[in-house]
């Protein structure tokens, strides 16, 4: 069941999931100057059975100048840098990530995708928070949020994290010692 809203926003922090539960949607969003092709789903879907899950549908972006072509343009230097980082993270994750039954890995990037990924999470999903560069984490408890169903309504638990204006970014699960990883899972790509 889909969570009614997005995970809580924490000032100076971003969140990501380690793995995505079946039923999760990832919007096919394109960077400026590109748009989703007119045939094909508006989102990718984590789908599968108890033994194997994968992303159904593929996102494709086309130049919004040339409406009916899938012509690609050369990314600008900053876009190349972004994409390179994303590709590297994706390759690392594909090589390292342990499969969780009923979960999908972070989907690999598609050409000319938007810089921010928009997910529609399902009940039971956990996301993990990290302070952005230049801010330090003060933990009052777990820096995570879980989408829960209560009395027929969904809600996200409040992450116990405050980010203060100091150096040293905090870690997501899997970025410190291996044993700090929940369920032994290594990292996946930033979703926000």
């Amino acid at each position: 069941e889909l969570c009614d809203d997005d995970p809580p926003k924490i000032t100076h922090a971003t969140f990501k999931a380690v793995a995505y539960k079946e039923g999760t949607m990832l919007n096919c969003e394109c960077k400026r100057g590109f748009r989703r092709i007119k045939s094909g789903s508006p989102y990718m879907l984590c789908t599968g059975n108890s033994s194997h899950s994968s992303w159904d549908n593929q996102c494709q972006c086309t130049s919004s100048a040339a409406r009916n072509t899938t012509k690609q343009v050369t990314p600008q230097p900053e876009e190349q840098k972004e994409r390179k980082t994303t590709e590297m993270q994706s390759q690392m994750q594909l090589a390292d990530q342990v499969s969780l039954p009923g979960h999908c890995r972070e989907p690999p990037p598609w050409e000319n995708e938007a810089t921010e990924r928009i997910y529609h999470f399902v009940v039971g999903q956990t996301v993990y928070y990290q302070c952005v560069q230049g801010y330090r984490a003060l933990h009052r408890g777990p820096a995570e949020s879980v989408c829960k169903m209560t009395h027929g309504k969904t809600r996200w638990t409040q992450p116990q994290l405050i980010c203060t204006g100091e150096t040293e970014p905090s870690q997501f699960p899997g970025e410190e010692e291996p044993q700090a990883s929940p369920d032994g899972l290594p990292e996946s790509e930033t979703s926000r």
Epitope: D5, C30, G40, S41, L45, H120
Partner: antibody, heavy 114, light 107 residues
């Protein structure tokens, strides 16, 4: 709490235009497409088009090109649909919808009558 | 445009029964189909996305199935509050299209 609040009922003359609004609350307006759907008794539901408030992109059903114009104002998290050259065929309830059709406004009834 | 056909405009059932509403697409739409419930005087309410996934708050007596061109919404243990019209929708390609609707009547 995610909500799509639509403007009230409209009674308009044939040949004129009408502009209705859809105010979004409870989510990041610029992240999600807003779609518009027409419903007439005996005609079911018809998809008019959609707009991405963040990028300003629009898609239209060919049937409604020239009839409907979709816009969005990110500062007020409001999407708009203008219908022009109105005829009795445009009398209907118009719904806005967002987040992959998960959420729907309450509908704006439009009556075209002289 | 992709045409969605809901061949039964009306279906009559009794409380506690099981009923299946069908939807046929004129071409392959994968699993890019949603189902909506509309009660008289209300907006459509999303029940199912991607052919078989329930939205939050939707009772588990509503089940979606199918892929390609044939889709089914099954309501098991029908309740009086299920009196409504049910629409299927494809969003596999523009323009998105809806089925003509099936009205569920409770005997």
């Amino acid at each position: 709490q995610i909500q799509l609040q639509q403007s009230g009922a409209e009674l308009v003359r044939p040949g004129t235009s009408v502009k209705m609004s859809c105010k979004a609350a409870g989510y990041t307006f610029t992240n999600y497409w807003i779609g518009w759907v027409k419903q007439r008794p005996g005609h079911g539901l018809e998809w008019i088009g959609d707009i991405h408030p963040g990028g300003g992109y629009t898609n239209y059903n060919e049937k409604f090109k020239g009839k409907a114009t979709l816009t969005a104002d990110t500062s007020s998290s409001t999407a708009y649909m203008q219908l022009s050259s109105l005829t009795s065929e445009d009398s209907a309830i118009y719904y806005c919808t967002s987040r992959n059709f998960a959420y729907w406004g309450q509908g704006t009834p439009v009556t075209v009558s002289s | 445009d992709i045409v969605l056909t809901q061949s039964q405009k009306f279906m009559s059932t009794s409380v506690g029964d099981r009923v299946s509403v069908t939807c046929k697409a004129s071409q392959n739409v994968g699993t890019n189909v949603a189902w909506y419930q509309q009660k008289p005087g209300q907006s459509p309410k999303a029940l199912i996305y991607s052919a078989s996934y329930r939205y939050s708050g939707v009772p588990d007596r509503f089940t979606g199935s199918g892929s390609g061109t044939d889709f089914t919404l099954t309501i098991s243990n029908v309740q009086s509050e299920d009196l409504a019209e049910y629409f299927c929708q494809q969003y596999n390609s523009y323009p998105y299209t809806f089925g003509g609707g099936t009205k569920l009547e409770i005997k």
